[in-house]
């Protein structure tokens, strides 16, 4: 309500190599699993660094005044705006993990607010009105979260909270199961 920005800089959330979260485990089944046990390539980081920026979740820092009608905060507050793409960049062998990053289309991740912080601000009003105290909720950090498959678009799940990270030199073992027979479980998989 009446935000006014006058400063803007950005921070990119780019985890260190080897720390990029795998997508959440997907339900595998006989149809999709034709794993050659010894057919693996050496472990690689699932993203090429040159492409990471294209798919990074950015925290844009905005410094603004809080306004409420004619009243304005005595000092500006700094908050984050989440921006950017989330998802794998280049197809490298470890990228599949239990997710299917080799597919042409897959889980849609969005860069959205993760944590919020409350900040008390003092609003100065014109005409000799007494200053007002107001608590505002500001975005403190951003995160990649998935648009869930069978839920409303607004319900987003974390990108890597429960995600299995690749173990160096090892491939995740497949779990053969029927996805269609496990729809109730699938609904909660993300």
């Amino acid at each position: 309500q009446g935000w006014q920005a006058f400063k803007n800089d950005a921070t990119e959330i780019i985890p260190e190599l080897g720390e990029y979260p795998e997508p959440p485990p997907e339900l595998e089944n006989n149809k999709t699993m034709n794993r050659a046990e010894n057919g693996g390539r050496p472990p690689h980081h699932p993203f090429e660094t040159k492409d990471v920026s294209e798919y990074s979740c950015r925290e844009l820092h905005f410094t603004r005044y809080v306004t409420d009608g004619p009243c304005r905060s005595a000092k500006p507050v700094t908050e984050l705006v989440c921006s950017g793409q989330c998802g794998p960049a280049r197809l490298l062998p470890n990228a599949i993990g239990r997710g299917k990053w080799w597919r042409p289309s897959g889980p849609d991740f969005r860069c959205i607010p993760d944590r919020y912080r409350a900040q008390r601000v003092q609003l100065l009003c014109p005409g000799g009105e007494a200053p007002r105290a107001r608590k505002v909720r500001l975005v403190a950090s951003c995160k990649c979260k998935r648009l869930t498959r069978f839920h409303n678009q607004s319900e987003l799940k974390d990108f890597g909270t429960e995600a299995a990270r690749p173990q160096k030199g090892r491939k995740p073992r497949p779990r053969a199961r029927s996805a269609k027979a496990n729809q109730a479980e699938l609904e909660n998989a993300y």
């Epitope: 999709t32 794998p88 280049r90 197809l91 080799w102 289309s105 498959r149």
Partner: antibody, heavy 119, light 110 residues
Framework: EVQLVESGGGLVQPGRSLRLSCAAS????????LHWVRQAPGKGLEWVSG????????DYADSVKGRFTISRDNAKNSLYLQMNSLRVEDTALYYC????????????WGQGTTVTVSS | QSVLTQPPSASGTPGQRVTISCSGS????????VNWYQQLPGTAPKLLIY???QRPSGVPDRFSGSKSGTSASLAISGLQSEDEADYYC???????????FGGGTKLTVL
Amino acid sequence: EVQLVESGGGLVQPGRSLRLSCAASGFTFDDYALHWVRQAPGKGLEWVSGISWHGDFIDYADSVKGRFTISRDNAKNSLYLQMNSLRVEDTALYYCAGNNRGYGGLDVWGQGTTVTVSS
Amino acid sequence: QSVLTQPPSASGTPGQRVTISCSGSSSNIGGNTVNWYQQLPGTAPKLLIYSNNQRPSGVPDRFSGSKSGTSASLAISGLQSEDEADYYCAAWDDILESYVFGGGTKLTVL
């Protein structure tokens, strides 16, 4: 130049088999996941099957499951589609396509090979 | 019938902006990324948009993609005669466990 060239198409009777090949050049073959997509005459695109870099993950469309087998030979830079128990409705132009960007669409396509199933 | 629904045809005059829609469900567009392909007459398809709104190198910025809920759109601004083609949307479907295409939209430049 990145290139995919399909071959092996032809006229075949229902119930018979055919094997399609796709030869790749101009790029590092095993950096790409590969797929077969078909297009019946005058119709839209239909994804048939896909295979990951080393053939360790495979997917099929329900319409071909149990009849078609996708495979690849990275030493020969080749992708294959073994088509058994062919049906009239399998008649189409079969494209070989690839992607080397996770969830990034099929960014490399061949020109296609025609399969006609008719008695 | 295709899993993803597109209008069979669309048209516009040179310089105009045209939008092609693609409607799906929560198991495909709702939770997965959307790609768009252009197929010029007599040629193989070409990737136009990936991951909802990303353009591969070489694709003019006149082409843009967007997604909201279980629908996606392809917008072409500054329409040119060479844009006359069939356009397909596509996304992974988690129930069918397949990469599904829309039925295609034939774009005519008048």
